[in-house]
């Protein structure tokens, strides 16, 4: 994790996950990059291309439908979160190429590496909101008929974004640039002022609120949804559930290495061999987490093709079909058992 201390009696390690490589030796002992850094650069390049184009397309498709389709609101907000994070990638890419030198100034150091954490919190809070929506559609259809509307959806998204910003503040506030002299470079990282407890607290909060608690609650939520949906359906079309589960599962899969190494580094001594090994893998863990920013459009496309692996429609119309299909609850006033089942089956939310 890129934490460093201004009075550290030793080198410290450069890197708090929120960037990419600060309080251990600056290892720029040759012009060649380490293998994990090279892999991180490859991932960043792919994520940037797919993430910017894919999420821009999702935003374009859903923006027109967001006024009338609640699902479109969910997907629009997820895509905006991913798109925003992708914008930081060229800068992060450049920094790794330059052996983690940060020539972009203090403001950029505070903002850009924090975008991936903003994305993490925004994504998981939006996924929680969407999951709550899915849950209510299945278990409280009458309530949904009366209260589930675009206005409420936008309010829920605003709350999610607000909380995400709030949770990203520690990273933003502690992030500083520091000049190194051997070799001469500027490093970007978090400074906990030699306070290991504070560093651990930040890592624990990040792990619990950004990973463990959502993992527990969403697992329970989707277990209930799956059980209800499967028990009430004769012909079980699981396309929607596959999309939902794929997006949620991908979140946890791609954030796992970041969270594990992050919590380990906060408890290890900066001079320990394990710490130094994890530090070398830091950029790779960040890049792996960044895959989240481009995976959703891929999932949508696969889902839109009906998992058959061939494109029958144009990409925008395919995405429109997946992302803007509205649940039956808004289209009918009469609620039968079959309507509720159809609704749970057809909703394309994450």
């Amino acid at each position: 994790m890129d934490s460093f201390n201004y009075t550290t009696p030793d080198y410290g390690h450069y890197d708090d996950k929120d960037t990419l490589d600060l309080n251990t030796p600056v290892d720029k002992t040759s012009n060649t990059l380490r293998v994990p850094d090279i892999l991180a650069l490859v991932i960043f390049a792919v994520v940037f291309l797919v993430g910017v184009l894919g999420n821009a397309l999702v935003v374009w498709v859903t923006a027109f439908e967001a006024k009338r389709t609640i699902n479109a609101i969910w997907f629009l907000n997820l895509a905006v979160a991913d798109f925003l994070s992708c914008l930081a990638l060229p800068i992060l890419f450049t920094s790794i190429v330059q052996h983690h030198h940060w020539p972009f100034g203090g403001a950029a150091c505070s903002i850009l590496p924090s975008l991936i954490l903003l994305n993490m919190y925004a994504s998981i809070l939006l996924l929680a909101t969407i999951s709550a929506d899915r849950f209510l559609l299945v278990f409280k259809p009458i309530w949904c008929q009366n209260f589930r509307g675009a206005g409420l959806a936008w309010i829920a998204c605003a709350v999610a974004w607000g909380l995400a910003l709030l949770l990203t503040i520690p990273s933003f506030l502690y992030r500083v640039v520091r000049e190194e002299y051997f070799p001469p470079k500027v490093l970007c990282g978090v400074d906990y002022s030699h306070d290991k407890r504070r560093e651990r607290a930040v890592a624990i909060v990040r792990l619990v609120l950004g990973f463990l608690w959502p993992l527990l609650t969403l697992t329970i939520c989707y277990t209930f949804i799956l059980l209800r949906t499967w028990s009430r359906r004769a012909t079980r079309s699981t396309k929607t559930l596959k999309v939902v589960v794929a997006v949620v599962a991908s979140f946890f899969i791609f954030w796992l290495p970041y969270q594990v190494t992050g919590i380990m580094m906060s408890f290890l001594e900066p001079s320990s061999p394990t710490f130094l090994l994890l530090k070398k893998l830091d950029s790779l863990c960040v890049s792996f987490a960044y895959i989240n920013c481009c995976i959703n459009p891929i999932i949508y496309v696969v889902a839109g093709q009906g998992f058959q692996g061939r494109l029958r429609k144009s990409l925008p119309s395919l995405l429109r079909n997946v992302l803007t299909e509205e649940s039956v609850v808004r289209e009918s006033k009469s609620f039968t058992r079959s309507t509720v089942d159809t609704m749970a089956q057809k909703t394309q939310a994450v």
Epitope: Y6, T7, T8, T29, E179, F182, P183
Partner: antibody
Framework: DVQLQESGPGLVKPSQSLSLTCTVT?????????WNWIRQFPGNKLEWMGY???????RYNPSLKSRISITRDTSKNQFFLQLNSVTTEDTATYYC??????????WGQGTTLTVSS | DIQMTQSTSSLSASLGDRVTISCRAS??????LNWYQQTPDGTVKLLIY???RLHSGVPSRFSGSGSGTDYSLTISNLEEEDIANYFC?????????FGGGTKVEIK
């Protein structure tokens, strides 16, 4: 023009602490750069000991980190070296020097320190 | 730590000679190789930084070259005032380290 001048006791007894001062003129130590301590042993071998940067960040040579402390007095434009539990092996000429990055641009004249009982 | 080795501890040359001092690093140090001159009175001056860049006020008869792990300092036309000890230093990783020095004397 920046100038650095070392000063110290000249003679220290083993197991005691040595304290050296580097007085900087012509440039503020809080404006930029890193302010280093380097020593040269009787056989001419040079060893970098550590630095304090303009921002206050400190780096030490790992071989000395348990014994060394570098501090500063910004009002007097001075920075200091303290080395604890000295032995005869610490007998050397001590230099302060400025680095703008990767190399030592300007050096003081040096102050000779002898550790002897 | 990166070890810096100056294989020749002293050399004798005549005034006007071309003198070359070599320095080897234990690993690739990119371009962060510097040369210092220490005169008999103990004064240390930076001569060349980043392999071949002349520090301000240094005469053009001094030049540096090399790459990877092998570097050299050349004095094209030795003068009396060049009688000194010359050190190489790597600045590519902490801690910065110095060579053992090469003493240039008059034959």
């Amino acid at each position: 023009d920046v100038q650095l001048q070392e000063s110290g006791p000249g003679l220290v007894k083993p197991s005691q602490s040595l304290s050296l001062t580097c007085t900087v003129t012509g440039y503020s130590i809080t404006s930029d750069y890193a302010w280093n301590w380097i020593r040269q042993f009787p056989g001419n071998k040079l060893e970098w000991m550590g630095y304090i940067s303009y921002s206050g960040s400190i780096r030490y040579n790992p071989s000395l980190k348990s014994r060394i402390s570098i501090t500063r007095d910004t009002s007097k434009n001075q920075f200091f070296l303290q080395l604890n539990s000295v032995t005869t092996e610490d007998t050397a000429t001590y230099y302060c020097a400025i680095t703008t990055g990767g190399y030592f641009d300007y050096w003081g004249q040096g102050t000779t320190l002898t550790v002897s009982s | 730590d990166i070890q810096m080795t100056q294989s020749t501890s002293s050399l004798s040359a005549s005034l006007g000679d071309r003198v070359t001092i070599s320095c080897r690093a234990s690993q690739d140090i990119s371009n962060y190789l510097n040369w210092y001159q220490q005169t008999p009175d103990g004064t240390v001056k930076l001569l060349i930084y980043q392999i071949s860049r002349l520090h301000s006020g240094v005469p053009s008869r001094f030049s540096g070259s090399g790459s990877g792990t092998d570097y050299s300092l050349t004095i094209s036309n030795l003068e009396e005032e060049d009688i000194a000890n010359y050190f190489c230093q790597q600045g590519n990783s902490l801690p910065p380290t110095f060579g053992g020095g090469t003493k240039v004397e008059i034959k």
